[in-house]
Structure formats: C-alpha cells, structure tokens
C-alpha cells in the first residue's frame, strides 16, 4: 500500500522536511503533490511526468520544494504556514489513480528563556518568592532546575501558571540556590541562565571561641565572636554589661584577676533587623611558678648508672605529673616513682632512655609543664660494622672502607691490616690494590668517655677470580605454609653475576620464588613440602664462573590427617586386632591411641589379641610433630561379633 | 651443542689492520665473556684481553693496549678482535675462548683458531 | 705482571710412569688452571681451580698446591697424554700463562 512518511515529522522553522515515499506502484505515468488531504487542483504544489522526467509546477508551489524521480518531496527553509497534510496523487500508465497523505508540524527554535522574580531579596521564614520563566510561547514545556538537580518534592514548592511560575513559601536559607528554567518544545530545548536566591536570615545565636572560660594571669584574652547571618552581622561586645567595641573580635593583653567577668557579644543584622546575643563567663586564676627537673647524673652509662629526676619547686598539696617523649608514663620495671611523684627514678639506663622529660604541677585550672629535658646517656661502642659488605674485590681497584659503631660520645676509629696499625680515621682507603692488599681487616671503636673498646674483623682478598660460592640461608628447618626461607650466595663481590638452580634447572617461574639484592639472594615465600629440593647458585665474572655445593631443604611439614590399616572395620570374637596407624610428617611425628576416648598406648601400632564383644568401640590415633607443633587425629568405629 | 667458528687465515702488510671473527653457536654471547688468547709459532700462550657483550666492557693486558680493539655484534652472535699498525712480531695464531655461565668454569670453550702472517 | 715459570720445559715419559709438572708464580694466586694442547689444535682445559677435574678428562690427572707453588700430575702415563700442558693464573691482570711444558712418549 502506498504510504507518506514525513522525516522528521516535528520540524523546526528554517529547516527542511522530505516526504519519503513508500511502496510506489510500478508502470507509472506520474504523479502530483497538494496541500491538503485531498487532490485539489488550486493546492497543487507540483507534478512530475516520468516519460519527459518534466516538473510542473502548480498553484500551491512556493519555490521551496523539490520532486524526486521517487516521487519523494523535499520542503526547505520551512516556514510556520507548511504545518499540514499533504496528499500524493498517482497517476498509473493504465490510467488508475492511487492516493496517500502524509503529515508534518512546523515548530519555533525557542529563544534562551530568562528568569523574573517578583522578590531579590526575601527575609527567610516571612516571604514567599514566585519565580517566572519568561517569554511566554505556545506549544511549549516548562521545566524548572535547582543547583542543576530537578525540583525536590516539598509541600513549601509550588508551580502554576502551566509550570512557568515556581513559587517557594516560607524561604529558608537552604533555598539560596541556583534557579534555572527550561522551555522545550518537540524542536528545541533552551534553558536560562542561573538566577541565585539571595535569602536574607539572621542572626542565629552568636558562638564564642574559643570554648574555654578559665585563664591564668598574665595571658592574653582573645575571643572571637560568629553568628549565621545574611548579610553578615555586626557584632559589639559588652563586659559586665559595658559597651567595649564594634568588632568581631575582642583582645585583651595580660590580662589579671580584675578581668573575670561575663563577656557579651551582640550580633545584629541590619537587613532583617533582629538582635541576638551570647554570654559567657570568664574566671582569671592567679599565675603558679613554672616547674624545673633536676637530675643527679648528667652523663649516666649506659646498663650501669640509674637517674634520678626531681620536680622542683616543693609544694605542698600539689599533683605532680611526669611525661616521657610527650607522653604519659610506660608501665616499665625500671621506671619508679616516689610517694609525692614528685621523683622519678630510672633504674640501669639504656640509649633509649634519651627522653625528652617533662614534669607538671596542676592547680584548680591546668597543667603547667616544665621544660624538657633530655638526658645524655653514654653508650658503646657497638661491635662496629664494616661496610661495604663485599668481601672479594679485583685487582686495580680502590678498596675503600667505612667502619661504624654506635656510641656516644662518638667512637674513634682505628684501622689494623694483619695485625698492624694503620691509621687513626673512620674511613680506610687503599687505591689501586693487588693480590697483596689481601688479608684481615680489623676496624676498632673506642668510646673516651666510657673507656670501652670493640673491634670487627673481615677478611678482604683481592682477586680477578671469584672462589668456590657457598649458601647461607636464614632458616634451617622452615614450617611448611607458614615460614619464608631466604638463601644467600657467598661470597658478596663487585661486578658479579649470580644465578641460581633448583634440581640441577634453572629455576621456575613462580610467586613464590623471589631474587634480590643483586640476584643474590633468593626467597622462598610460604614454603611446602615440594620445596625441599637441592638448591644451587653460581657466580660469574669477567674470569671466572662457579657453583655451589647443593643446599638442600629440609621443609617441616604435617602431621597429615593420619590412615589406620587395616581398614576392616568388622572382626569376629577370638581374632587379633593390629592397627597400625600412618601419617605424612616431617620430622615423623608421635603416635598414640584412645579407646572410646581413655588413652592408651603411645606408639605406631595398637595390637589387642583375641578380641571379644567387650573390645567393641571408637579407636582414636592421634599424631603430633613436635617440631611443627601441630597435631592430628583421625576415629575408626570397631564392631566384633560374637 | 657450544661452538665458535673464527675467520680465515689472514695474509697482511706491515703497517696495516686486519680484523678477525669468532661466530658463537648453542649460547647466547651476551651471556657471558669473551677471552681472546695469541700463540706465536712455536711459542707460548699470551692473553691479550675481554670483551662483556652485553654492555661493551673491556679489559686488555698491557701489552696490547692500543694493538687490539674488541668489538661485539650481538645480533649475528659474534665478536670481533681488531689488530692495528701490524709488525712481524703480530704474526700467530689468535684464538677465542668463553665460558658459559651454566658451566662451571671459564677457557672450557675455543675456537679453533686464525692464522695471521705479516709479510711485506 | 705475575709471572708463571713451568718445570722442566720438556719431559719424557714411558707408558704407565708418574709424570708432575710444577707451576710457580711471582705472587701469591688463589687458584691455578691447567690447559693440555696438541700441535695444529686449540688449547683444552684439564684441571680448573687447581684441582677440578674437567669435563670428559680422564681420572688420571690431578692439580694440587696452594699459593705460589702448584702442581698437575698424571698418575700414568698414555700415549695420548703426549702434548704441551701451561698453567694459567686468573687471579691478577693481566691473566698469565706458563711458558709451557712439553711431555713426550719415550
């Protein structure tokens, strides 16, 4: 059937519209288009004759309009007046008419809508605000935005006038917001730009900061009044009911006793005009001493003196408080305190009792703190470490060596090779060494103050070739899915390459394996039983390539949930029971069992001859591996028959 | 199966270069080091030097300082001994020589040697 | 340089007698090598790291020493043994090699 479609069917003034013909008959001799929803000579717009491919235009025909050899016609730069049917008539080449109408509606591009109001500035729990969108048109929608969000539903929101006016009752100052209105229509959608609602409010009770009303003599009163306002309030302070100032804030440098009082702060907004008002009251206390620590040895040592720490001055009916690196006192054996606390003792001292410490004493309205104190505790020297770690190094090079010690007073240093004496520095070095700068290596620390003396022996040997390496691990027996196991190849040298094997493979990818420290050492994280295999690493340089000696790991692990045999479970009277119990573990665990829960033998196998009814019951072999600590069981229901 | 295959023998003029291949094969060359080592006829063996692939690191003896020049070309696997301002006393036979790093030890691997003769 | 001298600088053996060859050196050295070679072939390692056998070398060879004094010793003598046997120190560079021993089959 022959059918019409307009695209689009809304149109917009300006634009244009095609009206798509469907199902047009074949063997045609042409056809016409009219205004209208019947064929009417006077409404002709155009007619096509397919044999001469000619157009004719008709009465109705603007200039805007173009007929297709589909017979499809488009309208341009559409006008308000096109809105309309439109009628196509077909003309057959066996002289049969067809006719199909087709529509469309013409709309206005909206213009950018704006906002009105009937009120700029409503006072907040007394007006109401009406909103309107303007212009006014026809055929359009209107929606209405809040801080770019669809209208919330509230009962003080109201939208009449067709939705074009929104009026808010009763304004709050939640409703300073941004307004924004939209008008659409099936062409356009336009939205205004922000109008933002300025609500008047206030003043709300004034706040005073800060909160504290107790201050000591001679220090500075300084309070700071704020009260929600719109537009923002005007403050004034009163003492004792005396006007002071118009400000926001009130200053009174050291202040006495004489300024304890009640403090008023009045807020007023010009706008609104309403007052409120806060008072609070202030007490000024007389100023105490600041409390001082006296110590009775300034330079203890360390694991030998004890310190004791005085608060002074002595007064009596005072609480003394104590506070180590700002905090309260730990609960330590070595920390006491005498009946008044007013001392505090420190018994055998270590490095890390450095502090600082503060004492207080605490009248009617605070804390008055001390300066702190630190003490100078004298400690090591520590067994020095020498650094860098390698131990071998290539010919040429330069060997150069650190030593340190933790020590106070700081430690001196002293560098020996083989025994003799080099020089009294931190830092030892040799430049270009050779196989000759071979040998050991002694780092000594002296402490002064102290008169202590500890010293760190290495052993350097100086050659292109690396040795035989070795692994070191960190754990010798690791427990199966709970420790990690780190190897380390030795020795640690220079411009060194390290490789690994695991089961004469290299090794495998996994989350489990990780290489660091130069690919040195590798980790095992989460160790199982699979892991106890033979483990190699290999070191190479410029001259020379070696392995290890296999390393192999020995994974603690079970005990698993144990096997009885034999598993018959149904003996007759006058047979022998021999159970033998059996579970994965390493170290192999220890066994023992229960009948009907009553122990009985601590061994592998339970042998009960010539068994009767009496024998009949649960047998429980439990299993423990002492060296994982973890244990296991497992029950077998017996049954004998007479 | 671990290989180097050297360059030809070499015929040269005093005063000139010659420049010498070793083409390894079963191991990657950047893996480890390479060595190369001179016999003259009826003489010892001299070290001259190595050469690290993987960043061009060298290491020449003394001797043989400003004679040789090593040079690697990891895409073809090879190394090359360069030999500048030849005298009599350059003619030998040069050879390369590697250890893998999965072996235990280094030299384990020759090449099987190029003749150089300098005559005018 | 750390010099490597050899002794003696030719040897003649029997098949089936003791032969050892020493190795001395200027300075102290970890460990020393030792490289067999036949006339027209490339040198061949026998004993690395003084006394590790190499690869495919037959149990009659063996290293020994330590410091400056270093040994390698076949146990008996085979017709195939018959070469130039040189040290090799890799401890300082430049690397050294020994001026080389030459055992013949009497």
């Known amino acids: 059937k022959l059918t019409i479609e307009s695209t689009p069917f809304n149109v917009a003034e300006g634009k244009e519209v095609l009206l798509l013909v469907h199902n047009l008959p074949q063997h045609l001799f042409g056809y016409s288009w009219y205004k209208g929803e019947r064929v009417d000579g006077n409404r002709q717009i155009i007619g096509y004759v397919i044999g001469t491919q000619q157009a004719t235009p008709g009465p109705a025909y603007s200039g805007r309009e173009i007929i297709y050899p589909n017979a499809s016609l488009l309208i341009q730069n559409i006008i308000q007046n096109d809105t309309g049917f439109y009628t196509l008539h077909v003309i057959k080449s066996d002289l049969v008419n067809e006719e199909a109408t087709g529509q469309f509606r013409v709309y206005p591009e909206l213009p950018k809508p704006s906002i009105s109001s009937n009120n700029s500035k409503p006072v907040e729990d007394k007006d109401a605000v009406a909103f309107t969108c303007e212009p006014e048109t026809q055929d359009a929608t209107y929606l209405w935005w809040v801080n770019n969000q669809s209208l919330p539903v509230s009962p003080r929101l109201q939208l009449s006038n067709g939705n074009r006016t929104l009026t808010l009752f009763n304004v709050t100052r939640n409703d300073t917001a941004s307004y924004k209105c939209e008008t659409q229509n099936p062409v356009s959608a336009r939205r205004s730009d922000s109008v933002i609602l300025n609500v008047l409010y206030g003043p709300d009770a004034p706040t005073i900061s800060p909160l504290n009303t107790s201050y000591r003599s001679g220090e500075n009163l300084n309070l700071s009044c704020h009260a929600a306002s719109n537009p923002p309030a005007q403050y004034s302070w009163f003492v004792n009911g005396t006007f002071q100032q118009s400000t926001q804030e009130l200053f009174i440098p050291n202040i006495t006793v004489n300024n304890s009082g009640s403090y008023t702060c009045q807020a007023h907004n010009s706008d609104t005009g309403l007052n409120r008002t806060t008072v609070t009251t202030i007490t000024v206390y007389a100023e105490p001493p600041k409390p001082f620590i006296t110590s009775n040895n300034s330079n203890p040592v360390e694991d030998e003196d004890a310190v004791a720490l005085t608060c002074e001055p002595e007064i009596q009916n005072t609480t003394y408080l104590w506070w180590v690196n700002n905090q309260s006192l730990p609960v330590s054996p070595r920390l006491q305190l005498s009946n008044d606390n007013r001392t505090l003792t420190l018994l055998s001292v270590t490095r890390n009792d450095v502090g600082p410490y503060e004492c207080g004493i605490q009248n009617e309205l605070s804390v008055d703190h001390s300066d702190p104190v630190i003490l100078n505790v004298l400690y090591g020297p520590d067994d020095p470490t020498i650094s860098p770690s390698y131990t071998y190094y290539r010919p040429g090079v330069n060997l150069s060596l650190s030593c340190h010690a933790a020590s106070n007073p700081p430690a001196q240093y002293s560098w020996l090779i083989d025994g003799n004496i080099q020089q009294h520095t931190q830092e030892l070095f040799i430049s270009n060494i050779t196989e000759k700068n071979s040998g050991l290596y002694t780092c000594q620390a002296n402490n002064s103050a102290s008169g202590h003396s500890r010293t760190t022996v290495k052993t350097i040997t100086v050659s292109a070739e690396l040795p035989k390496p070795s692994i070191s691990s960190n754990n010798s027996k690791p427990v199966e899915d709970k420790d990690a196991v780190a190897f380390t190849c030795e020795p640690e040298a220079q411009n060194t390459t390290y490789l690994w094997w695991v089961n004469g493979q290299s090794l495998p990818v996994s989350p489990r394996l990780q290489l660091s420290n130069g690919n040195r050492t590798l980790t095992l994280f989460n160790v199982t039983r699979n892991d106890a295999r033979a483990y190699v690493c290999g070191i190479q340089n410029s001259v020379s390539a070696n392995r290890s000696d296999p390393v192999t790991l020995d994974v603690l692990y079970g005990p698993d949930t144990p096997i009885i045999s034999p598993p018959d479970s149904s003996y007759l009277s006058g047979a022998n029971l021999n159970l033998s119990c059996h579970s994965a573990s390493n170290p192999s665990p220890q066994y023992s069992w229960r009948i009907n829960g009553i122990p009985q033998q601590h061994t592998q196998v339970l042998f009960i001859a010539k068994i009767t009814p009496n024998n009949n019951g649960t047998y429980a072999c439990f299993v423990s591996n002492l060296a994982t600590g973890r244990n296991n069981s497992i029950v077998k229901s017996i049954t004998v028959s007479a | 199966q671990v290989q180097l295959q050297q360059s030809g023998a070499e015929l040269v003029r005093p005063g000139t270069s010659v420049k010498l291949s070793c083409t390894a094969s079963?191991?990657?060359?950047?893996?480890?080091?390479m060595h190369w080592v001179r016999q003259g006829p009826g003489q010892g063996l001299e070290w001259i030097g190595w050469?690290?692939?993987?960043?061009?690191?060298?290491e020449y003896a003394p001797k043989f300082q400003g004679k040789a020049t090593f040079t690697t070309d990891t895409s073809s696997n090879t190394a090359y001994l360069q030999l500048s301002s030849l005298t009599s006393e350059d003619t030998a036979v040069y050879y390369c020589?590697?250890?893998?790093?999965?072996?235990?030890?280094?030299?384990?691997?020759w090449g099987q040697g190029t003749t150089v003769t300098v005559s005018s | 340089q750390n010099v490597l001298t050899q002794s003696p600088a030719i040897v003649s053996a029997s098949p089936g007698e003791k032969v050892t060859i020493t190795c001395s050196a200027s300075s102290s050295v970890s460990y020393m090598h030792w490289f067999q070679q036949k006339p027209g072939t490339s040198p061949k390692l026998v004993i690395y790291?003084?006394?590790n056998l190499a690869s495919g070398v037959p149990a009659r060879f063996s290293g020994s020493g330590s410091g400056t004094s270093y040994s390698l010793t076949i146990s008996r003598m085979e017709a195939e043994d018959a070469a130039t046997y040189y040290c090799?120190?890799?401890?300082?560079?430049?690397?050294?090699f020994g001026g080389g021993t030459k055992l013949e089959l009497k």
């Open positions: 050469i690290d692939p993987e960043n061009g690191d060298t």
């Open positions: 790291s003084t006394s």
């Open positions: 079963g191991f990657n060359i950047k893996d480890s080091y």
């Open positions: 020589n590697e250890g893998t790093p999965t072996g235990p030890y280094y030299f384990d691997y």
């Open positions: 090799q120190q890799r401890s300082s560079y430049p690397l050294t």
